[in-house]
């Protein structure tokens, strides 16, 4: 926890943030909570970004006050106004941009005092992979596809039967730039797969880690995928 010190006779209040990541082009959340106040009109929330001289967002007297908002955030920010009274100062950031990455400060003033906490916000692109059997290939082949990643991730194949095996010699990964010229489509092909085995395609960059599993038996194919954001830690 980062605790601010009281100024001008005011006490400090505890403000807590959680480092997070935003998926470019989508909406993101910058998490911040504080010791609540009983009167909404006494609560001021200011979001600041390192290197940006205008405010990211300001909420006071029960409503947004955006006269000093920096241009780069205009029309893209909102707090959860109905949750401010219970101590939620989290910021919704619309249409996350690559340039939104950086250090943010959540600064809170209430009748009890003031406090602030910083958070690191990473931006990139990440998506669920889907693994399929490639019936067009000459040999038993799996194809792992994920539509949007940035920065360029690493792709590693693993199997339940051959644990610890290195599949780099029997796989081929390509990255295709998407139309917006930032994110890339990831395609990885694994050759010489055997039946009655579970294969995992693991895609990872410094923001997220995603895994697509496929279990191939003579009678059925089972798929499962999950995505995990990295480095989410509280301050």
């Amino acid at each position: 926890l980062i605790i601010g010190f009281g100024i001008s006779g005011r006490h400090s209040i505890t403000v807590t943030t959680v480092a997070s990541a935003g998926n470019i082009g989508e909406d993101g959340i910058l998490s911040c909570t504080f010791e609540p106040d009983i009167k909404l009109s006494d609560i001021v929330i200011q979001w600041l970004k390192e290197g940006v001289l205008g405010l990211v967002h300001e909420f006071k007297e029960g409503k947004d006050e955006l006269s000093e908002q920096d241009e780069m955030f205009r029309g893209r920010t909102a707090v959860f106004a109905d949750q401010v009274i219970v101590g939620n100062a989290s910021l919704r950031l619309k249409n996350v941009q690559l340039t939104d990455a950086g250090t943010y400060k959540c600064y809170i003033i209430t009748s009890k005092g003031k406090g602030n906490a910083n958070l690191e916000y990473k931006t990139g692109a990440f998506s669920m992979p889907e693994v399929n059997v490639d019936y067009n290939a000459s040999s038993e082949t799996l194809r792992c596809e994920a539509p949007r990643w940035f920065p360029q991730p690493t792709v590693v194949w693993a199997s339940q039967v051959d644990q610890g095996a290195n599949f780099s010699e029997v796989s081929n990964t390509s990255f295709e730039l998407n139309s917006e010229n930032v994110t890339m489509k990831v395609v990885s092909v694994l050759y010489n797969v055997t039946i009655n085995n579970t294969y995992s395609c693991m895609i990872e960059n410094d923001i997220a880690k995603a895994t697509g599993d496929i279990k191939v038996t003579e009678s059925e194919i089972k798929r499962r995928s999950h995505l995990q954001l990295l480095n989410s830690k509280a301050s």
Partner: antibody, heavy 121, light 107 residues
Framework: EVQLLESGGGLVQPGGSLRLSCAAS????????MHWVRQAPGKGLEWVSA????????YYADSVKGRFTISRDISKNTLYLQMNSLRAEDTAVYYC??????????????WGQGTTVTVSS | DIQMTQSPSSLSASVGDRVTITCRAS??????LAWYQQKPGKAPKLLIY???NLPTGVPSRFSGSGSGTDFTLTISSLQPEDFATYYC?????????FGGGTKVEIK
């Protein structure tokens, strides 16, 4: 030692142009926002312009908007103020100053010694 | 723009006196306020930031207080080197503004 050193001032006719430079040393230049502040003879301080650490955002006082341009060259650790269409009321000592604080909320903690601009025919 | 009004515009005091200068903002600026000292022919020097904080090297006889719209700079015991002009400045708006200054002269 953290230091700012302005240059480029001088005598110029109304309507003329000047470019002020501010050489920074002793700190990581691209992590600090920078300002230009001026002081007319016998008067108080007047904020002129500011630029973010990356150079991506610029800000101007209404009195100079459209005539002055602030910029920075990170490779040269130098801040600039291009002044066009100069007027008599632009006559002042011009200071460059570094903004304290990572979020722009604090004051200006390092100042140059100033360079004098005189606009007169 | 946010107007910053300083008072008095000038004052006369003796060494050892307690001196108080006030600054009023035309709107709430929270604690986004700095104080500067300027001597003739010299660049301003930061005395106080964030309304109450002293930068390293500034003597402890200087102190700042206030938040919102009303702020005070206090010199607890005036020293010979403190005779100068003092300015307040707000950073809440990205149209930064200074107060008109307070000249502290020897009585």
């Amino acid at each position: 030692e953290v230091q700012l050193l302005e240059s480029g001032g001088g005598l110029v006719q109304p309507g003329g142009s000047l470019r002020l430079s501010c050489a920074a040393s002793g700190f990581t230049f691209n992590t600090h926002a920078m300002h230009w502040v001026r002081q007319a003879p016998g008067k108080g301080l007047e904020w002129v312009s500011a630029i973010s650490g990356s150079g991506g955002s610029t800000y101007y006082a209404d009195s100079v908007k459209g005539r002055f341009t602030i910029s920075r060259d990170i490779s040269k650790n130098t801040l600039y103020l291009q002044m066009n269409s100069l007027r008599a009321e632009d006559t002042a000592v011009y200071y460059c100053a570094r903004l304290l604080g990572r979020f722009g909320e604090y004051g200006m903690d390092v100042w140059g010694q100033g360079t004098t601009v005189t606009v007169s025919s | 723009d946010i107007q910053m009004t300083q008072s008095p515009s000038s004052l006369s005091a003796s060494v050892g006196d307690r001196v108080t200068i006030t600054c009023r903002a035309s709107q709430n600026i929270y604690t986004w306020l700095a104080w500067y000292q300027q001597k003739p022919g010299k660049a301003p020097k930061l005395l106080i930031y964030d309304a109450t904080n002293l930068p390293t090297g500034v003597p402890s006889r200087f102190s700042g207080s206030g938040s919102g719209t009303d702020f005070t700079l206090t010199i607890s015991s005036l020293q010979p080197e403190d005779f100068a002009t003092y300015y307040c400045q707000q950073s809440y708006s990205t149209r930064w503004t200074f107060g008109g200054g307070t000249k502290v002269e020897i009585k």
